[in-house]
């Protein structure tokens, strides 16, 4: 008799999840020699241990502590780039500006980027059929708790000037419910962080509005100021030109506004 399986509203675990996590760990340590002390098999065991045999709506940050410990990594605290709803451009930027880091440029962020995973209570099986959706099912699911945990730690580590890339094409340029708005903003440490600088990325070719005056940006400024952190904002009118100028800063066209 087939065992009854909980049907969740979200997509199931990404196919080849164990193989992908292990392969990504090996790749990361090849690319980043400073992380070669990491034992990738132990990393996978700790990752698996965080959610296997546990109810996928009952995951805690504590479940991920063994993984967090194994993945401890020091990134330059003044070279952190946060992002919200504009991941691809943020990653294109750090690919060119090699001394800056998004969360996905760290081992733990790299391991989990774009993946979904969950288990089932009291069985060692990974659920490839469905996983809980944050809104429709529960917020304490394995994926959401993971990102909340690593995002909090990443924000806590930041210092000096912290940059955040925001999507100017969205109705809420700053969204209080995003990971940036709900976790990272509140975990920047005022005793270490001097300024949060927002880069608002324009989508339209002819969009010359000052999106730094957007009400949601003003809301972000208010939250940040109340936390005794300075706030600044820049419009990036031409993201393509912006990237090109990061690659070739001496280009004559890079002195004008981008």
């Amino acid at each position: 008799v087939p065992r009854w399986r909980q049907q969740w509203s979200g997509p199931g675990t990404t196919k080849r999840f164990p193989e992908t996590v292990l392969a990504r760990c090996v790749k990361y340590t090849e690319i980043h020699p400073e992380m070669r002390h990491v034992d990738c098999q132990s990393v996978w065991d700790a990752f698996k241990g965080a959610f296997i045999s546990k109810h996928p709506c009952n995951i805690t940050e504590e479940d991920y502590q063994p993984l967090m410990k194994l993945g401890t990594q020091t990134v330059p605290c003044n070279k952190i780039l946060l992002w919200s709803r504009i991941k691809d451009l943020a990653h294109q930027f750090t690919q060119v500006q090699r001394d800056m880091f998004t969360l996905e440029d760290t081992l733990l962020g790299y391991l989990a980027d774009d993946l979904t995973w969950c288990g089932e209570f009291n069985t060692s099986k990974i659920n490839y059929q469905s996983c809980p959706d944050w809104r429709k099912d529960c917020s304490n699911n394995p994926v959401s708790v993971f990102w909340k945990t690593v995002s909090r730690r990443f924000a806590e580590a930041a210092c000096d000037v912290v940059h955040v890339m925001l999507n100017g094409s969205r109705s809420k340029i700053f969204d209080k419910n995003s990971t940036f708005g709900s976790v990272e903003v509140h975990n920047l440490q005022p005793e270490k962080v001097q300024t949060l600088e927002a880069w608002v990325i324009h989508g339209g070719r002819e969009d010359s509005r000052d999106l730094c005056q957007d009400p949601t940006i003003k809301e972000l400024e208010s939250i940040i100021s109340k936390r005794n952190i300075q706030f600044s904002c820049k419009n990036i009118y031409r993201p393509d030109k912006f990237l090109q100028c990061v690659k070739n800063p001496e280009d004559s066209s890079c002195t004008s506004e981008i």
């Epitope: 193989e19 790749k27 020699p33 690919q95």
Partner: antibody
């Protein structure tokens, strides 16, 4: 078993570009970093750079920056290395290579090599 | 970039002889040195990884040692099929760099 099969020999004129392919089998392309190494006639081995095929991230040796483009097509499990503005000193055998799970960070897996001749 | 200075550049030895090749790194590379064998017209073949670990299927006459900056590769008893060029490579930092190679011939 893991296999890396490269495209055939190429003869190019100075100033032209060449694109060498490396089709993998026995594993998924995105599961490993792909490295490129070249060897001039009667010369030693020279590492050119790597690509992480999953994200398209690359790291190219200083000597080749601006002339080398590494790409990957995950739908066909093929990695590519394009070298532009060819000169006679680019005449070499070009290899793709990758690490394994029980080989530290050495390269147990190599393509058979692609000979590129640059001649006017 | 880390320079890998390999010596000798060539050597001639008799079958059964012990052959030793050295590689010196310009800075500390821990134990991240690999040794390759390359025969004419063929791709290099990994023999030793992480300074002293024999790769799967490699005969026990091949061995490696060293850490930091000084590394040694040894063929305990040279066989006719060992005629090849041998390279060291540091895999500690990018860019990876190779030694200049040692061509081994039979007397």
């Amino acid at each position: 078993q893991v296999q890396l099969v490269q495209s055939g020999a190429e003869v190019k004129k100075p100033g032209a570009s060449v694109k060498v392919s490396c089709k993998v089998s026995g594993y998924t392309l995105t599961d490993s970093v792909m490295n490129w190494v070249r060897q001039g006639p009667g010369k030693g081995l020279e590492w050119m750079g790597w690509i992480d095929p999953e994200y398209g991230r690359t790291d190219v040796a200083q000597k080749f920056q601006g002339r080398v483009t590494m790409t990957a097509d995950t739908s066909t499990d093929t990695a590519y290395m394009e070298l532009s503005s060819l000169r006679s000193e680019d005449t070499a055998v070009y290899y793709c290579a990758r690490t394994g799970y029980n080989s530290g960070y050495g390269f147990p897996y190599w393509g058979q090599g692609t000979t590129v001749t640059v001649s006017s | 970039d880390i320079q890998m200075t390999q010596s000798p550049s060539s050597l001639s030895a008799s079958v059964g002889d012990r052959v030793t090749i050295t590689c010196k790194a310009s800075q500390n590379v821990d134990s991240d040195v690999d040794w390759y064998q390359q025969k004419p017209g063929k791709a290099p073949k990994l023999l030793i990884y992480k300074a002293s670990n024999r790769y799967t299927g490699v005969p026990s006459r091949f061995s490696g040692s060293g850490s930091g900056t000084d590394f040694t590769f040894t063929i305990s008893s040279l066989q006719p099929e060992d005629i090849a060029t041998y390279y060291c490579m540091q895999s500690n930092t990018h860019p990876r760099t190779f030694g200049g190679g040692t061509k081994v011939e039979i007397k």
